[in-house]
Structures are given as structure tokens and as C-alpha cells.
């Protein structure tokens, strides 16, 4: 109509899928009576009557909106429930009196896509590919309208780049009218991309504004040939015999090449291949000094039949040889002197020390131990320890027994044993001397003798307690080429008043004699050994 004003832009109403859209008829009272309104939907420029308002009462027209429309706000607003993407169109209300006017509303529908699902190319990408290869696929399901996708590498957005980066996106419409977006990132990767983190981001709009959702980060397997091969040894630092040592071959290629580890044979100048475990690791357990030498790793790239060699690695397994002491079995007269010398070989500087076996007392720091004016008590064990101070735990020891010539010494001079008549008693008698003594008993019984060490002997006698034995007691006699000595065991009958122990007796009804508190020798002068020599 000439002179008629241009049609105003429709009012915009934004709503999320599934919610209710409130379509407020914006006609003023002068433009029409809101108690008499027709509502239309416009789709592809075709208008369809969907709702009538008469005298303030609403009535749906048959069709797709029949069940979802209702009047609100005293008839001025039409409520559309369960909004779908198909509802994105223009709705208009038309007043009937005083003259026909219409008010247009553009309904915009939104739906956030689901979390983007990213799938990395499981086959991986070789770095030498001539064109961009598929890195990952991003899928954003059930969004409306179509979301925008942005790809990121290490937190930076990726742009299309000829022959380097290509992003291929497509979308499908679900029966619900929602869109599923699929985006494929193709790229030419380099070796440094082996640790690169890729993710996709979906940008979408809701009535509340712009939003985005990010996928998880993924890394793509990147394949590149090995350029460098090297060996690593664990543990790092000084190695010693007995350690568990792992020699591992490493390469900078992916996938790792086939490895072999070889040890140089100094006599043949050939590298002899060692047996590795399934992971290509050579395990030396326990490590021995023979494992020392030059190791190298060979790696084969089976794609090209190119073989690569590592730099050789020198392995040193530190050791201490068997310790030798001279003289090996020393024998000396009382009052004489003795020099003990200790020797050993090692891959490192050695420290020696001499210890008394019985007490662990350090007697000398150094390989030579000198003993003067030897007494009977000096007999026994001396231990040489050869150690490498720079490597804790690397040491070897050798024990030598010194024998001092002399008549037998008895473990005790006399002792009281509590007994019951007619019991079988187990008596023991201990003596030492050099040459080693033998022990005899003055009563009949079953005797057995055992060596405690080269200079010491223990004899055990099983005997029946008789009245005669109670009267005489029992004697044991130790003898060697240099003399003899005797110990006496007094037998006492047990009664309730004799159960209190004293320092020179053995208590209880045990069939074995307890160890002595003192040692005595029954020659004319009685000597007591120093406490450390006690066998208590």
C-alpha cells in the first residue's frame, strides 16, 4: 500500500531446546484488541494458522502445534512448550479490530552440543609423509545450530596451512533436527610433535551468550627413524661384584629398533653378542669382575636394513680377590713372636685391618699384624679384612687360627652337678691345648668326643647315677704330648633345700651340664683366662 511504513524487524526470542518459548504479542491497544487474535507460524514464506484467541479464550488449530500451545498473561502471550529445532521460524499475531495489524516474532532455538569426543589416529603418523595425514577426529553430537570447531596443538589454535595443516569438517542432521559435527585434523608432523598435545574445542551459542567445550588432550604416535643409539647402565656410579647391573640399549627412534648388546673380547678383538631379556636389557646378576669390559649396542632399522652402532661404554665391576694370609696355619711357642701378612688384589686401592675373631676388636690397620711375647690366651682366630673404602660393602675376609703350644687347659677345675639316684646323667668336659688334647673318663659309660676347633675338644659321657658314683664323683682327664690335666665333677643328690643356685654349681635336673663360669687348669698354679675367652 503506497505510503505504508516499512515492516519492522521481528522481535527476537531465544530459547533452548526442550524448554518453553513465551511469544508475547506486541500489538498495542490502538493496533488491535488482544481478546481477538490469530497466531500464525511462517515457514518458507507460507503462513499457517496455529492458534485463535476469541474473547480471551484460546483454541489450538489441528496440526504440529496442537498439543504444545497455551495462553498466558491474560491472553497476551502464547506459550510454546517442548521447543525443537524445527520450531526455529517466525511466529506472528494478528489483531482483528479495529483494523487488521500483525506483530512478528523470530524464534531462535539453541542446544549445547555434548562434550566433544576426540579419537586419535591409532596407526600413528610417519614424519616423512608427503602430505598431511590424519591426526585425530573430533565429534560434537546433538548441537544446534552447528557449532564451530577449533583445533589446538600445545594450547595454540591451528590454522589451515597449505600442505601442512588441513581441517575437514562435516555435519549430519539427526532425526531430532540436532546437528552432529565431525571434524578431521590432518597435518604433517615432525619428530618434535611426538609429545605434542592436541585437542578440539566446540564453540556454540545459547540464549545466555557464547560458550565452548573442550575435548580431552591426546598425543598421536609419531614414527621416525632412529638416528642415535646409546647405552645406559644402572645403577650409576661405582659397581661392585654381587651388584645387580642392567645394561640397557636406547634409541631416539619410534618405534624402537631391534637391539643387540655386544661385549668386546680383548683377545679376539671381536664383539660377542650378549643374551638380553625380552626388553633388550642385559642383566648381570650377580655382577662379576669378568663382566668388566667394553659394551656397545647395535640397532637395526628393519625398514631400511640400516644398522647403527652406539658409542662403546666401558663397564668396570670392582672387585676384591680372595684374601691370602701367610702363614696360613701358624703355630708358636709361648713367649715367641709372630708376623701375619695379608694380601689381596682389587680394581681399586685397598685398606686392610686385622681383627680378633672372638671379640671383633681391631688390632691393626694395615696388611701386617705383629704379635710379640705370645701368651696362651693369644691362641685363636685372627681375621684380615681387605676393603675398598670408596665402595661401601666391597670387602673380603680371611680367618687364620693361631695355635700356641702347651699342655691341656680345662674349661673348669671342678664343678658340682645336682642329680637324682638312678637317673642317666649327661656329663660334659671341655679342654683345649696344642697339640689338640684327647679326653678320658675315670668311670665306665658311653663317651663321645667332638672337635670344637683345632685346639679344643668337648667330650660327653652318659652314665647311670649309682650310690658308688655319688661317693667318688667323676673325673675327666685331658692329655697331649706336652702334659695332662684333670677336672672333677661332684655329684650331689637333689632335695628341696638344695635348689638355690650358687656361682660354682649347676642347678636343676637338666641332663646336660651348663657351660662353665670359669676355666681352670689343674697344674700346680691355677690361672684364670681373661673374661673374653670365657665360654659362658
Amino acid at each position: 500500500v503506497p505510503g505504508e511504513a516499512e515492516q519492522p524487524a521481528p522481535e527476537l526470542v531465544e530459547v533452548e531446546v526442550g524448554s518453553t518459548a513465551l511469544l508475547k504479542c506486541g500489538l498495542s491497544q490502538s493496533q488491535g484488541n488482544l481478546s481477538h487474535v490469530d497466531w500464525f507460524s511462517v515457514h518458507k514464506e507460507k503462513r499457517t494458522l496455529i492458534f485463535r484467541v476469541r474473547q480471551g479464550q484460546g483454541q489450538s488449530e489441528p496440526g504440529e502445534y496442537e498439543q504444545r500451545l497455551s495462553l498466558q498473561d491474560r491472553g497476551a502471550t502464547l506459550a510454546l512448550t517442548q521447543v525443537t529445532p524445527q520450531d526455529e521460524r517466525i511466529f506472528l499475531c494478528q489483531g482483528k479490530r479495529p483494523r487488521s495489524q500483525e506483530y512478528r516474532i523470530q524464534l531462535r532455538v539453541y542446544k549445547a552440543p555434548e562434550e566433544p569426543n576426540i579419537q586419535v589416529n591409532p596407526l600413528g603418523i610417519p614424519v616423512n609423509s608427503k602430505e598431511p595425514e590424519e591426526v585425530a577426529t573430533c565429534v560434537g553430537r546433538n548441537g544446534y545450530p552447528i557449532p564451530q570447531v577449533i583445533w589446538y596443538k600445545n594450547g595454540r589454535p591451528l590454522k589451515e596451512e597449505k600442505n601442512r595443516v588441513h581441517i575437514q569438517s562435516s555435519q549430519t542432521v539427526e532425526s531430532s533436527g540436532l546437528y552432529t559435527l565431525q571434524s578431521i585434523l590432518k597435518a604433517q608432523l615432525v619428530k618434535e610433535d611426538k609429545d605434542a598435545q592436541f585437542y578440539c574445542e566446540l564453540n556454540y551459542r545459547l540464549p545466555s551468550g557464547n560458550h565452548m567445550k573442550e575435548s580431552r588432550e591426546v598425543t598421536v604416535p609419531v614414527f621416525y627413524p632412529t638416528e642415535k643409539v646409546w647405552l645406559e647402565v644402572e645403577p650409576v656410579g661405582m659397581l661392585k661384584e654381587g651388584d645387580r647391573v642392567e645394561i640397557r640399549c636406547l634409541a631416539d627412534g619410534n618405534p624402537p629398533p631391534h637391539f643387540s648388546i655386544s661385549k668386546g673380547n680383548p683377545s679376539t678383538r671381536e664383539a660377542e653378542e650378549e643374551t638380553t631379556n625380552d626388553n633388550g636389557v642385559l642383566v648381570l646378576e650377580p655382577a662379576r669382575k669378568e663382566h668388566s669390559g667394553r659394551y656397545e649396542c647395535q640397532a637395526w632399522n628393519l625398514d631400511t636394513m640400516i644398522s647403527l652402532l652406539s658409542e662403546p661404554q666401558e663397564l668396570l665391576v670392582n672387585y676384591v680377590s680372595d684374601v691370602r694370609v701367610s702363614p696360613a696355619a701358624p703355630e708358636r711357642q709361648e713367649g715367641s713372636s709372630l708376623t701375619l701378612t695379608c694380601e689381596a688384589e682389587s680394581s681399586q686401592d685397598l685398606e686392610f685391618q686385622w681383627l680378633r675373631e672372638e671379640t671383633d676388636q681391631v688390632l691393626e690397620r694395615g696388611p701386617v699384624l705383629q704379635l710379640h711375647d705370645l701368651k696362651r690366651e693369644a691362641g685363636g682366630g685372627y681375621r684380615c679384612v681387605a676393603s675398598v673404602p670408596s665402595i661401601p660393602g666391597l670387602n673380603r675376609t680371611q680367618l687364620v687360627k693361631l695355635a700356641i703350644f702347651g699342655p691341656p687347659w680345662m674349661a673348669f677345675k671342678e664343678r658340682k652337678v645336682w642329680v637324682k639316684e638312678n637317673m642317666v646323667l649327661n656329663l660334659s668336659c671341655e679342654a683345649s691345648g696344642h697339640p689338640r688334647p684327647t679326653i678320658s673318663w675315670n668311670v665306665n659309660g658311653t663317651a663321645s668326643e667332638g672337635d670344637q676347633d683345632p685346639q679344643r675338644v668337648l667330650s660327653t659321657l652318659n652314665v647311670l647315677v649309682t650310690p658308688e658314683l655319688l661317693e667318688t664323683g667323676v673325673e675327666c682327664t685331658a692329655s697331649n704330648d706336652l702334659g695332662k690335666n684333670t677336672s672333677i665333677l661332684f655329684l650331689e643328690l637333689v632335695n628341696l633345700t638344695t635348689l638355690t643356685p650358687d656361682s660354682n654349681t649347676t642347678t636343676g635336673l637338666s641332663t646336660s651340664t651348663a657351660s662353665p663360669h670359669t676355666r681352670a687348669n689343674s697344674t700346680s698354679t691355677e690361672r684364670k683366662l681373661p673374661e673374653p675367652e670365657s665360654r659362658g
Epitope: 609423509s129 643387540s260 678383538r269 664383539a271 625398514d303 636394513m305
Partner: antibody, heavy 120, light 112 residues
């Protein structure tokens, strides 16, 4: 019959670039490892580059690493050598070679070679 | 890198006589597991590309006459032509493939 025909050689100034090609026939090109070997005038042989059958693995000696790139197009039965930052010492006859099916690296078949001269 | 040294640099031998070329490696080329040496020999006649003669140090390539024999192990290798023929005039190269690939400098064989 296995045939390897090199092309692309010529005169180039120091610092310049050149791309050599090798057309292969008489065998299934995509199944074989290929290499380039060169020979300076009056001198011995020097290995230059190797590429796996699928093209994913490449190897070079230190003398050309970072300057030369070996590639292949299996659809075209062709092998290439892109040579950049050329030097006078790169002057040589360049041979295209094919490996054989042995478990060892050998150059079983050779082309006739193409001459590359680097000179100002 | 492995250095390959050939000796002599050149060799003049009468027809029908034996020719011996030596090749020495700066390190062993023997793979002790498979007991094979990563060494090959090539022949290059004047104006022609090289030709593979021997691989694994002693395995003759098919079609190569049996007068050509490769021997040796570890670091010392030999190519022997038992009875030199006129067509054997060429430069002979050894090549290692134990660590990347390197050729010897070549030995020229001529007729005396």
C-alpha cells in the same frame, strides 16, 4: 628386467638446489628399499641416502644430513633426491640403487648415473 | 665411524694368475649371534656403474663367476680372483654395513 634411470643432473652454482629423479621399472617398486650413491670424478664410492619401501624411514651420512632429502612416489615408481645448499664437494655422478631381499644392506641394482656439477 | 682401508691401491696381475685384494675395517664387522660379517664387495668396470659381487663377506651374488672368492672375518677381509681374466679389469670396493654404510677407497686391478 630391473631398470633404474636417473635424471635431473646438471650444472648448479654453490648454494643452489637441484632435484634428481630415478624412474624404476621391471620390479614391484613399492616393495624395495632404495638408495642414492655418488662418485666424485676419479674418486671412490660414497653412500648418500636410503629410504624404506613405504617412505617412512630415511637415513643419510653426516656429510649430507640436513641438506639432502630422499623421497619416493610409489604410485609413479619414482625415487627422488632433493639437494639444497650445494657445495663444490657435492660434484659427482649420482647413482640410484635398489636393495635385494637379503638380510643385509647391499646395493644389488644400479642405474647408469646422472652427473651433478657444482661450480661458479 | 667405521673406516675401511683397502690394500693395495692398485694391482697388476698376469692373465690366469691369482689377484688378492685386502680390506681392513677399523672395528669388527662380525655379528656373533648369526656368525656373519657385514661386508660386501663391488666391482666397477671403466665407464660402468658398480656391480655387487659378494655379501656376508663370502656369499657370492648369483651370476658371479666362481673365480671370485670372499674370505675373512672380524676386521680382515680378502677378495681373491683365482685366475684373472681380461674382463676382470676394474676397480674393486669393499663396503661395511655394520654401522651405517662406508666404502673402502678402492683397488684398481690391471693386467700385467
Amino acid at each position: 628386467e630391473v631398470q633404474l634411470v636417473e635424471s635431473g643432473g646438471g650444472l648448479v652454482q654453490p648454494g643452489g638446489s637441484l632435484r634428481l629423479s630415478c624412474a624404476a621399472s621391471g620390479f614391484t617398486f613399492s616393495s624395495y628399499i632404495m638408495s642414492w650413491v655418488r662418485q666424485a670424478p676419479g674418486k671412490g664410492l660414497e653412500w648418500v641416502a636410503t629410504i624404506s619401501s613405504g617412505g617412512s624411514s630415511t637415513y643419510y651420512p653426516d656429510s649430507v644430513k640436513g641438506r639432502f632429502t630422499i623421497s619416493r612416489d610409489n604410485a609413479k615408481n619414482s625415487l627422488y633426491l632433493q639437494m639444497n645448499s650445494l657445495r663444490a664437494e657435492d660434484t659427482a655422478v649420482y647413482y640410484c640403487t635398489r636393495d635385494d631381499d637379503y638380510d643385509v644392506k647391499v646395493f644389488a641394482y644400479w642405474g647408469q648415473g646422472t652427473m651433478v656439477t657444482v661450480s661458479s | 665411524d667405521i673406516v675401511m682401508t683397502q690394500s693395495p691401491d692398485s694391482l697388476a696381475v698376469s692373465l690366469g694368475e691369482r689377484a688378492t685384494i685386502n680390506c681392513k675395517s677399523s672395528r669388527s664387522l662380525l655379528n656373533s649371534r648369526i656368525r656373519k660379517n657385514y661386508l660386501a664387495w663391488y666391482q666397477q668396470k671403466p665407464g660402468q656403474p658398480p656391480k655387487l659381487l659378494i655379501y656376508w663377506a663370502s656369499t657370492r651374488e648369483s651370476g658371479v663367476p666362481d673365480r671370485f672368492t670372499g674370505s675373512g672375518s672380524g676386521t680382515d677381509f680378502t677378495l681373491t680372483i683365482s685366475s684373472l681374466q681380461a674382463e676382470d679389469v676394474a676397480v674393486y670396493y669393499c663396503k661395511q654395513s655394520y654401522n651405517l654404510l662406508t666404502f673402502g677407497q678402492g683397488t684398481k686391478v690391471e693386467i700385467k
